[in-house]
C-alpha cells in the first residue's frame, strides 16, 4: 500500500526475488525461501470448517499479474496480496478474508475475521 | 453466566483411547466455534483445532493430525475430543476454549481436563 | 507455523511496578493478536484482544498495543493478584499460535 505522498517513480527490482514461503514451498527452497522472476505473495483462505489459513511463496512473472489482481470467485473466500520491492516482502504483508454479504449467513455462521478487502502491493 | 465444563481427570495406559467431554452453558453452543488446546506440565499453551459447531466441520493443526478427533452433541451443547493410541506424550490439560464468531481469540475456557498416560 | 517470541520469560517484579511484556510475530498479524491471563492451577484468562481491546471486566490497569509483528502488554501498576503466567497468541491464521508465557513473581 502506497502512503501519502509517497513516490510512484518505479523502482529497479532484484531479477531473483527471494520470497519467503509457507505451506507453499517448493522441493529446492531451503529454510522456508523460494526465489522467482515474478512476484513474492502472501494469500488467506478458509479451508473447509471456516479456519483461515494463510499461505505464502512465489509466483513467477507469468500470469503472475492475473493472479495477484485477486478477482473474487463465488462461494470462495480467499485474499491475495503480492509485493516485487524488495527480497522477502511478503513476510510484511497482511491479507484478509473479505467481510461477508449478508446472503452468506444464511449458509450459517461461518468463522472469518471481519476485516475490509486489501489490494494487492506492486 | 457462560461456562464450559470439562470431565474429570483421566489416567490411562499407553495404546488406550480417551473421550474428553466440554459442556456448554449460558449461551447459544451452535453460534460460537469450540477450540482445544493442550498444555503440557510446566509447558505453554498449544491450540490443536476446533469444530464448527453450526457446520459440524472440524480442523485440526498439522501436529494433532491422525490420533484426534473433534465431534459435537448438538441436542446436549456439548463438545468432544478423542484421543486414540495414547502416548506418553499426551500426558497434558486439555482445555475446551470458545471463541467468537469471525475471530479467533478465546474468550471463555473450560475448567480444563488432566489426562495422565503412564504404564 | 507462525512463531511468538515472547520475552522475557520471568519476571521479578514488586507491588507498584510497572511491567512491560512483548511478543514479537515472525510474520505480519495486523492487529490479531491476543494476551492471557493464566494462575497457577486455573484455567486462562482472555484479557485483551485485537491487539489492544480490553476484554469484559478486565482491569484498566492491562493494556495491549502493537501492529504487525511487534506487540506489548502492560500492567501499569502491578498488585498481588497479578501473579500469573501471561501469554500472547496470534489469531490470524491456522494454527494460533501462543508465546512461551511470561512469569510474574514476586520479589
Known amino acids: 500500500k502506497k502512503e501519502d505522498g509517497e513516490s510512484t517513480a518505479p523502482t529497479a527490482r532484484p531479477k531473483v526475488l527471494r520470497c519467503k514461503c509457507h505451506h507453499h514451498c517448493p522441493e529446492d527452497s531451503v529454510n522456508n525461501i523460494c526465489s522467482t522472476d515474478g512476484y513474492c505473495f502472501t494469500m488467506i483462505e478458509e479451508d473447509d470448517s471456516g479456519t483461515p489459513v494463510v499461505t505464502s511463496g512465489c509466483l513467477g512473472l507469468e500470469g503472475s499479474d492475473f493472479q495477484c489482481r485477486d478477482t473474487p470467485i463465488p462461494h470462495q473466500r480467499r485474499s491475495i496480496e503480492c509485493c516485487t520491492e524488495r527480497n522477502e516482502c511478503n513476510k510484511d504483508l497482511h491479507p484478509t478474508l473479505p467481510p461477508l454479504k449478508d446472503r452468506d449467513f444464511v449458509d450459517g455462521p461461518i468463522h472469518h475475521k471481519h476485516h475490509h478487502h486489501h489490494h494487492h502491493h506492486h | 453466566q457462560i461456562q464450559l465444563v470439562q470431565s474429570g481427570p483421566e489416567l490411562k495406559k499407553p495404546g488406550e483411547t480417551v473421550k474428553i467431554s466440554c459442556k456448554a452453558s449460558g449461551y447459544t453452543f451452535t453460534t460460537y466455534g469450540m477450540n482445544w488446546v493442550k498444555q503440557a506440565p510446566g509447558k505453554g499453551l498449544k491450540w490443536m483445532g476446533w469444530?464448527?459447531?453450526?457446520?459440524?466441520?472440524?480442523s485440526s493443526a498439522d501436529d494433532f493430525k491422525g490420533r484426534f478427533a473433534f465431534s459435537l452433541e448438538t441436542s446436549a451443547s456439548t463438545a468432544y475430543l478423542l484421543i486414540n493410541n495414547l502416548k506418553n506424550e499426551d500426558t497434558a490439560t486439555y482445555f475446551c476454549?470458545?471463541?467468537?464468531?469471525?475471530?479467533?481469540?478465546?474468550?471463555?475456557w473450560g475448567t480444563g481436563t488432566t489426562v495422565t498416560v503412564s504404564s | 507455523s507462525f512463531v511468538m517470541t515472547q520475552t522475557p520469560k520471568f519476571l521479578l517484579v514488586s507491588a507498584g511496578d510497572r511491567v512491560t511484556i512483548t511478543c514479537k510475530a515472525s510474520?505480519?498479524?495486523?492487529?490479531?493478536v491476543a494476551w492471557y491471563q493464566q494462575k497457577p492451577g486455573q484455567s486462562p484468562k482472555l484479557l485483551i484482544y485485537s491487539a489492544s481491546n480490553r476484554y469484559t471486566g478486565v482491569p484498566d490497569r492491562f493494556t495491549g498495543s502493537g501492529y504487525g509483528t511487534d506487540f506489548t502488554f502492560t500492567i501499569s501498576t502491578v498488585q498481588a493478584e497479578d501473579l500469573a503466567v501471561y501469554f500472547c497468541?496470534?489469531?490470524?491464521?491456522?494454527?494460533?499460535?501462543f508465546g512461551s508465557g511470561t512469569k510474574l513473581e514476586m520479589k
Open positions: 510474520q505480519n498479524m495486523g492487529h490479531d
Open positions: 476454549a470458545r471463541s467468537e464468531l469471525r475471530n479467533w481469540y478465546f474468550d471463555v
Open positions: 469444530i464448527n459447531t453450526y457446520s459440524g466441520v472440524p
Open positions: 497468541q496470534q489469531d490470524y491464521s491456522s494454527p494460533f499460535t
